[in-house]
C-alpha cells in the first residue's frame, strides 16, 4: 500500500492507498480505495492492459511435502491440490509435479541403502 | 459432485436486513468461486456478486455495493450473503451456485426473500 | 456493462423439431459464454459452457456455437422435457451479466 501526505486544509495528513483494482477483468479502468483515520476515498485508476498480470499464476495449488526420492528414476514427486482459479481459468483438480533428487540425495540414497532424506 | 443447501430467507419488513447461507457438502467447497444470483418474482436473473472462500477475495456487483455483503466460514464449509435495507423490489429467490471453469457449476436449491410489512 | 440480448424471447415448437435460440452480446466476448436452462420452480442448471463446450450428463442433442459477439444453443431434437427457459451468461468481464431468456413452449 502507498502512503502520501495530503496538505488540503482537511485533518488527515496521512493517507494509506490499496492497490488499483479493475472493475472489469485483469485490467482497465477500477478504483483505488484509500484510508485515513476514519475516512475513505474511492478515486478512479487504471491498471494497463499490456501490463503482465501480478496476480501470479492462474490456477494456484497447495502441495503436500516431497516424497522420497526414488532411486531408479532420480527424481521425487509430490501432488498438489487446487487451491484457487482464476475464474475462466480451466484448472485441474489436482496435479503431480516431479523434481530431480539433489546429488546430496542420491549419495545418501546410495550409502544407505534408499533411507536418504531430503 | 458438490451439494448446496440453502437457508435464510423468509418474509422481512423493509429497511431491515438478512443474512442467508449456503451450506456446501461433497467436494472442496474452499477451492471453487460461490456466486450469488436472484430472481425476481416472474423476471430474469440477476449476479449479486462472487467470493472466492480460500482468500475471501470478493468481486461485488456496483449495483449491490452498498446493499449486499459476502462473507465465508471456511470451517463450515458455508458462504453467506447479508443484505442490508431491504425494500419491496428486493423480493426474489436468492442462489448461490459454486463455479468451476473445469467442471462448470452447482447451485443450491435457492431461498425466497419476501420483503413486505 | 455488457448487455446480453436473447431471441426470440418466445419460441413454440413442437417436439421433435430442431431449436435454434440465439445470444447477441454488446461486445466482444471472446468464448466466456455459457447457457442455462430453468423450469418453474427449479434452480438454473448449466447445459453448455465456454461457447461449445458440453457438460457432463446434459444430452448430446444440445449444442453450442461462439465465440465473439454472436451464440447459438442448438437442441437437434426436442424432448417433451426441453420445454423451459433459456439464459445465456457471459463471464468475460464484471458484472457477470443475464440475457433477458428465451422461452421454449410446446407447438
Known amino acids: 500500500k502507498k502512503k502520501e501526505k495530503v496538505k488540503k486544509g482537511s485533518e488527515c495528513s496521512e493517507w494509506t492507498w490499496g492497490p488499483c483494482t479493475p472493475s472489469s477483468k485483469d485490467c482497465g479502468m477500477g478504483f483505488r480505495e484509500g484510508t485515513c483515520g476514519a475516512q475513505t476515498q474511492r478515486v478512479h485508476c487504471k491498471v494497463p492492459c499490456n501490463w503482465k498480470k501480478e496476480f501470479g499464476a492462474d490456477c494456484k495449488y497447495k502441495f503436500e511435502s516431497w516424497g522420497a526420492c526414488d532411486g531408479s528414476t532420480g527424481t521425487k514427486a509430490r501432488q498438489g491440490t487446487l487451491k484457487k482459479a482464476r475464474y475462466n481459468a480451466q484448472c485441474q483438480e489436482t496435479i503431480r509435479v516431479t523434481k530431480p533428487c539433489t546429488s546430496k540425495t542420491k549419495s545418501k540414497t546410495k550409502a544407505k541403502k534408499g533411507k536418504g532424506k531430503d | 459432485q458438490v451439494q448446496l443447501v440453502q437457508s435464510g430467507g423468509g418474509l422481512v419488513k423493509p429497511g431491515h436486513s438478512l443474512r442467508l447461507s449456503c451450506a456446501a457438502s461433497g467436494q472442496s467447497f474452499s477451492s471453487y468461486w460461490m456466486n450469488w444470483v436472484r430472481q425476481a418474482p416472474g423476471k430474469g436473473l440477476e449476479w449479486i456478486g462472487m467470493i472466492h472462500p480460500s482468500d475471501s477475495e470478493t468481486i461485488l456487483n456496483q449495483k449491490f455495493k452498498d446493499k449486499a455483503t459476502l462473507s465465508v466460514d471456511i470451517a463450515k464449509n458455508s458462504a453467506y450473503l447479508q443484505m442490508n435495507s431491504l425494500r419491496a423490489e428486493d423480493t426474489a429467490v436468492y442462489y448461490c451456485?459454486?463455479?468451476?471453469?473445469?467442471?462448470?457449476?452447482?447451485w443450491g436449491q435457492g431461498t425466497l426473500v419476501t420483503v413486505s410489512s | 456493462d455488457i448487455v446480453l440480448t436473447q431471441s426470440p424471447a418466445t419460441l413454440s415448437l413442437s417436439p421433435g423439431e430442431r431449436a435454434t435460440l440465439s445470444c447477441r452480446a454488446s461486445?466482444?466476448?471472446?468464448?466466456?459464454l455459457h447457457w442455462y436452462q430453468q423450469k418453474p420452480g427449479q434452480a438454473p442448471r448449466l447445459l453448455i459452457y465456454y461457447a461449445s463446450q458440453s457438460i457432463s450428463g446434459i444430452p448430446a442433442r444440445f449444442s453450442g456455437s461462439g465465440p465473439g459477439t454472436d451464440f447459438t444453443l442448438t437442441i437437434s431434437s426436442l424432448e417433451p422435457e426441453d420445454f423451459a427457459v433459456y439464459y445465456c451468461?457471459?463471464?468475460?468481464?464484471?458484472?457477470?451479466?443475464f440475457g433477458g431468456g428465451t422461452k421454449l413452449e410446446i407447438k
Open positions: 451468461q457471459q463471464s468475460n468481464s464484471w458484472p457477470l451479466t
Open positions: 451456485s459454486s463455479w468451476s471453469a473445469k467442471r462448470g457449476d452447482f
Open positions: 461486445e466482444s466476448i471472446s468464448n466466456n
